[in-house]
Structure formats: structure tokens, C-alpha cells
Amino acid sequence: EVEKTACPSGKKAREIDESLIFYKKWELEACVDAALLATQMDRVNAIPFTYEQLDVLKHKLDELYPQGYPESVIQHLGYLFLKMSPEDIRKWNVTSLETLKALLEVNKGHEMSPQVATLIDRFVKGRGQLDKDTLDTLTAFYPGYLCSLSPEELSSVPPSSIWAVRPQDLDTCDPRQLDVLYPKARLAFQNMNGSEYFVKIQSFLGGAPTEDLKALSQQNVSMDLATFMKLRTDAVLPLTVAEVQKLLGPHVEGLKAEERHRPVRDWILRQRQDDLDTLGLGLQGGIPNGYLVLDLSMQEALS
């Protein structure tokens, strides 16, 4: 807290400009009018204030707006945004995408801070859903943003927004998140033809059910092994050897290198060994010829 002292004669700030750079903290406190600061916030960004001086300027705004800053001030906070706490930001009502962009720009190149996370949360809640423009903006600044949301939060993403998602935006998503995103992507891309559809849907396939994988296997898609390894194990297990061969096309040879890893390992255990042998890859661990396979889960369901 800066001690309150009268502003020295001739030092009262008439505008926010370079002359304030060498003011001491108490001089800034005494000589800069908070209302003037609020109307000229855009100038603060261009002036090399120290972090100590920025603390004083923030304090002045806090006193002027105890209930939270108006958006006209928030939009021009610039580097002063880095001084805000999540508690400060929770008082704000940010509705303009331009304001969001301006503040994200200040934090550009850094990890998502608690301040930024709170800002985004406030913005999205205010909008009611994660629309395409917002998602475009957020993933441009934070490619991993989508995967930081809970499945519940992802459920508010409209299918139209899925067009903004790039493959790298899904790199850190877990199966629960892809379970929510996949149906939206399927809906968003439903009018595309086979090969174009597969290119777009590929990065969402970690959420695809068995029946959709079976359908893809009939379309000569040539899925690469990296995508196959990200598929849900429970969706892969029911696929036949022939279906997997069609799904992977020339990439089927890659199964040998992955035979000890999920989901390939678990899938092999469910296949007849003689069916696996037809691939000519030397895959081992299938069900020996002559053995009967009982699906106990099906039996329990019937009883």
C-alpha cells in the first residue's frame, strides 16, 4: 500500500504519458486521477512502467471500480492484465471477443495462467456456449485448450464449432473427451464425401464406436497405425481380422510392431489364430484352432 500524500505542485497528471515513467509510487498514487487513468488505459501499454508502478495503477482502478472493471477498461488493460488475480477477473463481465483477444495477446507465448483460465471461463459462461469464433480464437492462442475442458463443458460445444478444430488441438485429449467430441464431429462432417470425410474425422476417431469403424472399413480409408492405436479398445475388440485389414489397408503390416501394445494386444487375444495367420505377419496369441469362444457378458445379459 502506498502512503497517501498530497501531490507536489506542478506534478498533477493531465494525461497518461511518458512524463509519469520516473514518478515514484507515492507520486503516482497522489498525482494520477483514477478516472483519467480509466479513460486513457490504452496509453499505459506504450509506457515502460515498472511492475511496482503497475501495482499502483491497478490499485487506483480497484478503488474506482470495487465491483469489477467495465469492459471499456478491461479491453485496454494490456500488461496490467498480468497483475490481475483470478478473484479480480471473476468480478468482470467480458462479452466482446475483441476484449478476449486483446487480453490473450498480452499472455501470448506463455502457458495458460490461472488468470487466463478464469478469463476464458467467465467469457464462455457469459456466452452460454463455445461458439465457433470463440473456439477459433482460443485454439489459436492455446492449441491444447479443447482438451483442458471437462466432458461436461465440451457438451456445450455446438457441432458447427468443430470445423475450427485442428488435429493438434486434440493431441492431449483423453478418451472421455473424444467420446463427447466424436459425435459432434460426425454430425459436422456428415455431408462430406468419403475421402474428405475421413481426413476431417480422423483426429476424432478415438471416440468412435465399433459400428462406425466397421463402416469405415468398407471405404478403403487406409487408416495409419498412429490413429489406430488411439482408438477405443472396446471399439476395436469386436472387429474381425478382415475388417481390420480393410481399415488399415497397406498399413496393416504395422500391427506386428504394435502387437504387445493396446489395443492391438487385446484385439489379437480375441481373434482366432488361423484368421491372424491369413495376414502373414506372424502375429501370435490368438485363440488356438478348435477352441470354442463363449461370450460370458452376452450370456449374463440374456439371463
Epitope: 515514484k24 509506457i47 515502460p48 515498472t50 511496482e52 500488461y79
Partner: antibody, heavy 119, light 106 residues
Framework: EFQLQQSGPELVKPGASVKISCKAS????????MNWVKQTNGKSLEWIGI????????SYNQKFKGKATLTVDQSSSTAYMQLNSLTSEDSAVYYC????????????WGQGTTLTVSS | QIVLTQSPAIMSASPGEKVTMTCSAS?????MYWYQQKPGSSPRLLIY???NLASGVPVRFSGSGSGTSYSLTISRMEAEDAATYYC?????????FGSGTELEIK
Amino acid sequence: EFQLQQSGPELVKPGASVKISCKASGYSFTDYNMNWVKQTNGKSLEWIGIINPNYGTSSYNQKFKGKATLTVDQSSSTAYMQLNSLTSEDSAVYYCARVGRDNSGFDYWGQGTTLTVSS
Amino acid sequence: QIVLTQSPAIMSASPGEKVTMTCSASSSVSYMYWYQQKPGSSPRLLIYDTSNLASGVPVRFSGSGSGTSYSLTISRMEAEDAATYYCQQWSSYPPTFGSGTELEIK
């Protein structure tokens, strides 16, 4: 121990440009503003400008606007001053100087870089 | 911009003698700063905020003043104090320095 280490002497031709460096050590580079000062003939000192290493924002003495450009590289804790369109009037010793807490004077100075502009 | 006039321009003092030099500002300033510079060396901060001694500066140095009139005093001159002394203000933008007082040892 705090230190501001400047680049060595420069001999350049009129019309050319030069970039002087000032490497900071012993303190958090981004916490303190950096200034540049010109000294001609071992006499008067003139303030050129100031830069905030945290945000890269800068301010210049009107006299040096268009002549000097201040930049920083946070990764190497180094401040730079580029001087362009050099003339013999620019021949001087140039210092970088850190501003102390709450604007308590230029508390640490570099050793100075001698610039000679001559054809 | 504020002009700082230092006087005298050159002075000499004997070891042990009290030395006072002044800095007059063309307009009122809040604080004055004083620097010492020896030949071939960088300036060194002596006094900040008019009267505060910078780190490592001997207590024989002191500063005072207000408004447009400031002074630097050395209570007892020592040989190592031979140097040029500059006053500086940044109450008004841009910061400016005085033209210096050259102090010699007798």
C-alpha cells in the same frame, strides 16, 4: 554481484549503423528498467531513453527519436541500443544504466562503449 | 526540459576540508540525484532522493535541498574523492544532468 557488461569499442563510417549490447547479471533482468546515457568528450551526460525488459516498452528523449532504437533479449538478459545514420556528432561513450527500485536513481552502470564515427 | 546548473564548475580542496557544491534547477524538482565519475570510469550513484546515501558510499557524503536549490557536501575531503560530480533530476521529463563540478585535491 550485480554487473552490466557492455560490448567493446566501435569504429564506424558515417552513414552506417551500430548496435551496442549490455548484458546484465546478478539480478532479475526483467524486474528493472534499463536506460541508455550518452557522454561526449568526458563531459556532459545526456539521457537517451529507457526500456522495460519485461514488456519491451520503451520511451525516448525527443532528441534521440529516430536516432536510437532500444530492444531487449530476455533469454540472454541483454539490452541493446542501435544507433543509425551515424555522424561525427554521435562519437561518444554510451552507457547502459539500471534504474533502482521505485526510481531511486541509476544505481548500476555498464563500463561504457566508446563509439568513434570517422571516415 | 529542466536545465540543471552546477557551481562551481571547477574547485579544489585540501584533505580534511569540508566541500560543498550546488545544483540549481530552472524549475522546481521533487528529488535530486548525485553521481561521482572518475576519469576512465562509469558514473557511480552517490545520493538518491535528495539525501539518501547509495549502497557502499562513505558517510562523509551528504545531500540536501528542495525546490530549485540542491547541494552535495563532503564533510572531510579525501584524496579518493577527486572526481567530477553530476546532479540529475527526473521530476520533469526527460531526465537531465547538470554539466558537472570537477573537484581536485590540493
